[in-house]
């Protein structure tokens, strides 16, 4: 070994030369939180790049860049030494016009305490350990809920847009015609029943079981749907959005109000599978893989 | 292909009455917000002569208001458009409009949905 690299060695396996790095990256974090930072800190800045510079030119010398098996860059927590690094130097000294774009780059820094304390490298290797393991059931979820996002599309494409319309209209208007003019928030007051509070129009249905409309109002298939368009079974991906929503449980009662009211209560059933497999079932097991992970990495 | 069945046209004298029948009576038909009567003249426009909403209530164009009445038989899902008192003026094409909501099997569709059109003519 060549005196440098000897000198290289005790530097990276001295405790102060941790403590060096926690408290620059500590340091680091603090000053990224000030709002609007003084000029001097720019300098600051530099001290920071300097020494992550040094830390990295020390684990370079003491193991080598890439070629051998233990060298820098085999090592995963280097990626980000080296990405952090790299994106200071961009950062400061090339002009790439937009540069606010990668200064976001810079809270990778904070990442960089995961790699300096072993409790939260072991847990952080734990966490990656059970993404690798919840693939399984990660490919089962989303097989279960393209399965349920199709029947959904079958069963309620374009219901959620029936709404109650109003049965009195001028000489010259048609449904069609004022399909074609909806545009602002007002017309579509001016046309729908809405219930007092509430954003989007009375939902109905045309088979029994289904909401019905007021006096005066008739339900018809016209204009966008709830939540400004965002709840729907019209296509895939939103029945399988809406399906991943009554998985997590997010506001769900409100969508089976929804699809209950437009398309008939005998599709309570549809709701009641969904929720037992995809929400009890799946996420439980989901969390069971998660526990197991994290017990193989503790022993 | 959703088909209204219109019937009841002719040649009448003035003074005369006819009546006019639109059959939605196929089972696309779900449900409407009115059927109507309109009709259209030689040279003039498609005018709206009188419709029916689903809850019974009806609109009239005043030049017919008095003397055309409308009405609907919900079973068996047809309007008729009785014509009193017939002028040279009422000569025209006398169309039947479903405006309301159809069924394609696979979903709803809602709009307007027209007929083939009847022929009224008014002379001596």
């Known amino acids: 070994f060549s005196p440098l690299r000897r000198i290289s060695i005790k530097i990276l396996v001295h405790s102060l030369f941790s403590m060096l790095i926690m408290c620059t990256i500590l340091t680091n974090c603090i000053f990224m939180t000030m709002n609007n930072p003084p000029d001097w800190t720019k300098n600051v800045e530099y001290t920071f790049t300097g020494i992550y510079t040094f830390e990295s030119l020390v684990k370079i010398l003491a193991r080598g860049f890439c070629v051998g098996e233990f060298t820098f860059l085999r090592d995963p927590w280097n990626w980000l030494d080296f990405v952090v690094i790299v994106f200071a130097y961009l950062t400061e000294f090339v002009n790439l016009g937009n540069v606010s774009a990668l200064r976001t780059f810079r809270v990778l820094r904070a990442l960089k305490t995961i790699s300096v304390i072993p409790g939260l490298k072991t847990i952080v290797g734990a966490l990656i350990q059970s993404v690798k393991k919840l693939s399984d059931v990660m490919i089962l979820t989303v097989f279960c809920l393209s399965v349920f996002a199709l029947i959904g599309l079958q069963l309620f494409m374009g219901n959620l847009k029936h709404k109650c319309f109003r049965n009195s209209l001028e000489n010259n208007e048609t449904l069609e015609s004022i399909m074609n003019t909806l545009e602002s928030e007002e017309d579509f007051r001016k046309y729908f029943y809405y219930l007092e509070g509430s954003k989007d129009a009375l939902l109905c249905g045309f088979s029994t079981d289904s909401g019905q409309c007021p006096e005066g109002y008739t339900c018809v298939k016209i204009g966008r749907n709830p939540d400004y368009g965002y709840t729907s079974f019209d296509t895939f991906s939103w029945a399988f959005l809406a399906l991943f929503r009554l998985m997590t449980q997010d506001y769900w009662e409100n969508l089976y109000q929804q699809t209950l009211r437009a398309a008939g209560k005998t599709y309570m059933i549809f709701f009641v599978v969904v929720i037992f497999l995809g929400s009890f079932y799946l996420i439980n097991l989901i969390l069971a893989v998660v526990a197991m992970a994290y017990e193989e990495q503790n022993q | 292909e959703v088909q209204l069945v219109e019937s009841g046209g002719g040649v009448v004298q003035p003074g005369g009455s006819l009546r006019l029948s639109c059959a939605a009576s196929s089972r696309q038909f779900i449900r409407d917000v009115f059927t109507g009567w309109y009709r259209r003249a030689p040279g003039k426009q498609r005018e709206l002569v009188a419709r029916?909403?689903?809850?019974?209530?009806?609109n009239y164009a005043d030049s017919v208001k008095g003397r055309f009445t409308i009405s609907r038989d919900n079973a068996k899902k047809t309007v008729y458009l009785q014509m009193n008192s017939l002028r040279p003026e009422d000569t025209a094409l006398y169309y039947c409009?479903?405006?309301?909501?159809?069924?394609?099997?696979?979903?709803?569709?809602?709009?307007?949905?027209w007929g083939q059109g009847t022929l009224v003519t008014v002379s001596s």
């Open positions: 029916i909403y689903n809850e019974g209530n009806t």
């Open positions: 409009l479903f405006s309301g909501t159809i069924s394609t099997g696979r979903e709803y569709r809602s709009g307007d949905y």
